[in-house]
């Protein structure tokens, strides 16, 4: 009972850090203008994404430009759009594989191969937040490289957008949440006594039967 | 209009110590990073040194690290090079640069100022 | 330390013509490049930062690019006051380095 709840604890982290995943990556709020000093020339905050980069003025007007050429934009930008949708798609599968080996569902009967799945999906999980956690931080090592490079100009620098804290949070959920569907399946956590017999005693026979099998008669 | 006026060079012994200035005019010099850059005999340009606008940081190439000093005065609107156990090596044309809000590297330079370092 | 080694050190060309200047990186400096253009008995000036950028002032007949790292400076519809020297500078991380310097002539 309390393995089911940790597998629903587990999934539903997920399924949070995937919805998180999702607007981290599609929001343009991945470095965001930083004001230093009083050299302010413009009253307008620049927002840039992956996608797309906005501009909002101190009007509260916000015009937003789709980057032209995929060939044109920075290697860097390209790598960290590709881990983002690679991620969530990663996670999407490792969702499926769940699914097929939930407890509450009949794609697989078999307990061992549910409990594999499950353990499986877990792992899943695990690479996507791993996966979210590389575009996410790369881009932050190069907003606080730049912030203290001295001869980057104030107007170049850029901090730390919401997106970027976004993203951190749904690698945490992936990971906790693969963490926890991982851990709810022990190997033979979800097995009868017999198993356990059978793996770990060593004057269990090399072949043994399962209870239908033993003749039934002489019993009382 | 942005000026740098450096002053303090001349002809010193190996060994010996200089002290170069930079006279800012023209901008608020608290709001700026500065540099000084020098430029080889052979027009070779070699980054010296950079100190932050407030003068709280300071970046130094090892070639130049713990023989040179950098340091800045904002209420004099200067900046200063202190150079001791000069080498024949540190004989150039140093600059005095100031950094820009909307420029990356090195953006107004001064006319610079001769430092010969020989017997 | 980076090195940047430029190329060619020096070169000559036509009035009205095309010439570009390249600059390589010893490893990945992103698009941390600085163009410089000292004219004769003058301070070096900046031209081009973050390897494509026009500072302002400096004439649309100058462009920056970046292939990996690689680096050029492009002068199109060359003009008589572009004979100077051209410097890349780096300033992707300490120590920041020049490039060794090249020399534009006027045919």
């Known amino acids: 009972m309390a393995s089911a709840g940790m597998q629903i604890l587990g999934v539903v982290l997920t399924l949070l850090g995937w919805v998180n995943g999702l607007v981290s990556c599609a929001l343009p709020m991945w470095k965001v203008t930083a004001f230093i000093g009083n050299s302010i020339v413009v009253a307008q905050v620049v927002w840039e994404g992956l996608w797309m980069s906005c501009v909002v003025q101190s009007t509260g007007q916000m015009q937003c430009k789709v980057y032209d050429s995929l060939l044109a934009l920075p290697q860097d930008l390209q790598a960290a759009r590709a881990l983002c949708v690679i991620a969530l798609l990663v996670a999407l599968f490792g969702l499926l594989v769940y699914l097929a080996g939930a407890k509450c569902t009949t794609c697989v009967e078999e307990k061992d191969s549910k409990a594999r799945l499950v353990l499986t999906s877990g792992i899943v999980f695990v690479i996507s937040g791993v996966l979210t956690l590389i575009p996410v931080c790369w881009t932050a090592h190069a907003i606080i490289r730049d912030f203290y490079n001295p001869l980057v100009a104030e107007a170049q620098k850029r901090e730390l957008g919401a997106s970027l804290y976004l993203g951190w949070a749904a690698s945490g959920l992936l990971l906790l949440g693969g963490g926890l569907l991982c851990c709810t399946c022990p190997s033979g956590g979800s097995q009868g006594p017999s198993h356990y017999m059978a793996r770990y005693s060593t004057s269990a026979p090399a072949i043994s039967r399962g209870p239908s099998e033993y003749p039934t008669k002489n019993y009382v | 209009e942005v000026k740098l006026v450096e002053s303090g060079g001349g002809l010193v012994k190996p060994g010996g110590s200089l002290k170069l200035s930079c006279a800012a005019s023209?901008?608020?010099?608290?709001?700026?990073?500065m540099s000084w850059v020098r430029q080889t005999p052979a027009k070779r340009l070699e980054w010296v040194v950079t100190i932050s606008s407030g003068g709280g940081r300071t970046y130094y190439p090892d070639s130049v690290k713990g023989r040179f000093t950098i340091s800045r005065d904002n209420a004099r609107n200067t900046l200063y090079l202190q150079m001791s156990s000069l080498r024949s090596e540190d004989t150039a044309m140093y600059y005095c640069?100031?950094?820009?809000?909307?420029?990356?590297?090195?953006?107004?330079w001064g006319q610079g100022t001769l430092v010969t370092v020989s017997t | 330390d980076i090195q940047m080694t430029q190329s060619p050190a020096s070169l000559s060309a036509s009035v009205g013509e095309t010439v570009t200047i390249t600059c390589r990186a010893s490893e990945n400096i992103d698009s941390y490049l600085a163009w410089y253009q000292q004219k004769q008995g003058k301070s070096p000036q900046l031209l081009v930062y973050a390897s494509t950028l026009l500072v302002d002032g400096v004439p649309s007949r100058f462009s920056g690019s970046r292939s990996g790292t690689q680096f050029s400076l492009k002068i199109n519809s060359l003009q008589s006051e572009d004979v100077a020297r051209y410097y890349c500078q780096h300033y992707y991380s300490i120590p920041y380095t020049f490039g060794s310097g090249t020399k534009l002539e006027i045919k």
């Open positions: 023209g901008f608020t010099f608290n709001s700026y990073t």
């Open positions: 640069i100031r950094g820009d809000y909307r420029y990356d590297g090195f953006a107004y």
